[in-house]
């Protein structure tokens, strides 16, 4: 496939990745699907520098990222290793809190108003950030 060399319209380029910042809210699974349909994924934060960049663009608003533990272990949606990777949880988080009364614990991670991370009920309609890497082979077949 051809390689993407510049970001799509309305996406922001940063460090060889493209980012799209929603202005509406969706449940985590719907946000995840939205990004996939854009040949992207929910944002995967791999460094303090990337954390600061995303935080600057989203402001003090709860925003989904591509991290969840719905199947047990914490997993980044692109396969980045959680255990060895960057983490920026709020103190006392993640806590898998059951006291919300909505059923289950808290299985999806989001940026909080100060940028640090919290786990929350995946059905909550938060904003989200999509990310796709430049130089990644696109899904379009090559021209013959």
């Amino acid at each position: 496939g051809s390689e993407r060399t510049c970001c799509p319209v309305n996406w922001v380029e940063h460090e060889r990745s493209c980012y799209w910042f929603s202005r509406s809210g969706k449940a985590w699974a719907d946000a995840d699907n939205y990004c996939r349909l854009e040949d992207a994924h929910l944002v995967v934060v791999t460094s303090w520098e990337e954390q600061k960049f995303v935080q600057h663009h989203i402001g003090p608003v709860n925003t989904w990222m591509g991290l969840h533990d719905q199947n047990g272990p914490w997993k980044w949606v692109d396969g980045t290793d959680y255990e060895t990777g960057f983490k920026n949880w709020r103190p006392e988080q993640p806590d898998d809190w059951y006291g919300h009364g909505l059923g289950g614990g808290e299985d999806c991670a989001h940026f909080t108003d100060d940028g640090r991370w919290n786990d929350d009920v995946c059905q909550r309609p938060y904003r989200w950030v999509c990310e796709t890497e430049l130089d990644k082979a696109s899904q379009e077949p090559p021209l013959l």
Epitope: D69, N71, G72, K87, G103, G104
Partner: antibody
Framework: EVQLLESGGGLVQPGGSLRLSCAAS????????MSWVRQAPGKGLEWVSA????????YYADSVKGRFTISRDNSENTLYLQMSSLRAEDTAVYYC????????WGQGTLVTVSS | DIQMTQSPSSLSASVGDRVTITCRAS??????LAWFQQKPGKAPKSLIS???SLQSGVPSKFSGSGSGTDFTLTISSLQPEDFATYYC?????????FGPGTKVDIK
């Protein structure tokens, strides 16, 4: 590789106390809730207690409430179960398990309550 | 507390058989259901979480389905190593509760 290793089991008299430990390795311990589950000889599984990743929330089965205390030391990657006022019906293999869905288990430690 | 029931309590099957175990919750638990396999003298092993998500390393002959109150675990082609006791467990709300187990043995 994830490892959970329980210890501290043994023979104790009715009314006595025991503290179980579960040493965890191979994962970010503080990111996961942890549980204790027990299995009496020849019986099924019974969930006993759970604790959130930070230790801020604890939960207990009615059968052990007021007698057992779950805790954790995230600096030492260790989960504990302090058991007091033990009864014959507490005799079981005690397992520690990782995560809300208990997706990884230790090999268990046997607690026998008998005079 | 949420009560979990399983059926059958035991079953005899042959190698190659398709086996289905049913688990029912006394109230709705969405998809907060896990399945475990336990062999004699061994710790339980997680097979499935979130009702249908196979744990890493678990063969695809195991599958789970269901939501709400009714759930199933299916073994598509039973192998000698699959003879064991299977438990379901809800983690929708505390206290977590297990089903009584289904023992699968050789016919």
């Amino acid at each position: 590789e994830v490892q959970l290793l329980e210890s501290g089991g043994g023979l104790v008299q009715p009314g006595g106390s025991l503290r179980l430990s579960c040493a965890a390795s191979g994962f970010t311990f503080s990111s996961y809730a942890m549980s204790w589950v027990r299995q009496a000889p020849g019986k099924g599984l019974e969930w006993v207690s759970a604790i959130s990743g930070s230790g801020g929330y604890t939960y207990y089965a009615d059968s052990v409430k007021g007698r057992f205390t779950i805790s954790r030391d995230n600096s030492e990657n260790t989960l504990y179960l302090q058991m007091s006022s033990l009864r014959a019906e507490d005799t079981a293999v005690y397992y520690c398990a990782k995560g809300g869905s208990l997706f990884y288990w230790g090999q268990g430690t046997l607690v026998t309550v008998s005079s | 507390d949420i009560q979990m029931t399983q059926s059958p309590s035991s079953l005899s099957a042959s190698v190659g058989d398709r086996v289905t175990i049913t688990c029912r919750a006394s109230q709705g638990i969405s998809n907060y259901l896990a399945w475990f396999q336990q062999k004699p003298g061994k710790a339980p092993k997680s097979l499935i979480s979130a009702a249908s998500s196979l744990q890493s390393g678990v063969p695809s002959k195991f599958s789970g389905s269901g939501s709400g109150t009714d759930f199933t675990l299916t073994i598509s082609s039973l192998q000698p190593e699959d003879f064991a006791t299977y438990y379901c467990q809800q983690y929708n709300s505390y206290p977590f509760t297990f089903g009584p187990g289904t023992k699968v043995d050789i016919k």
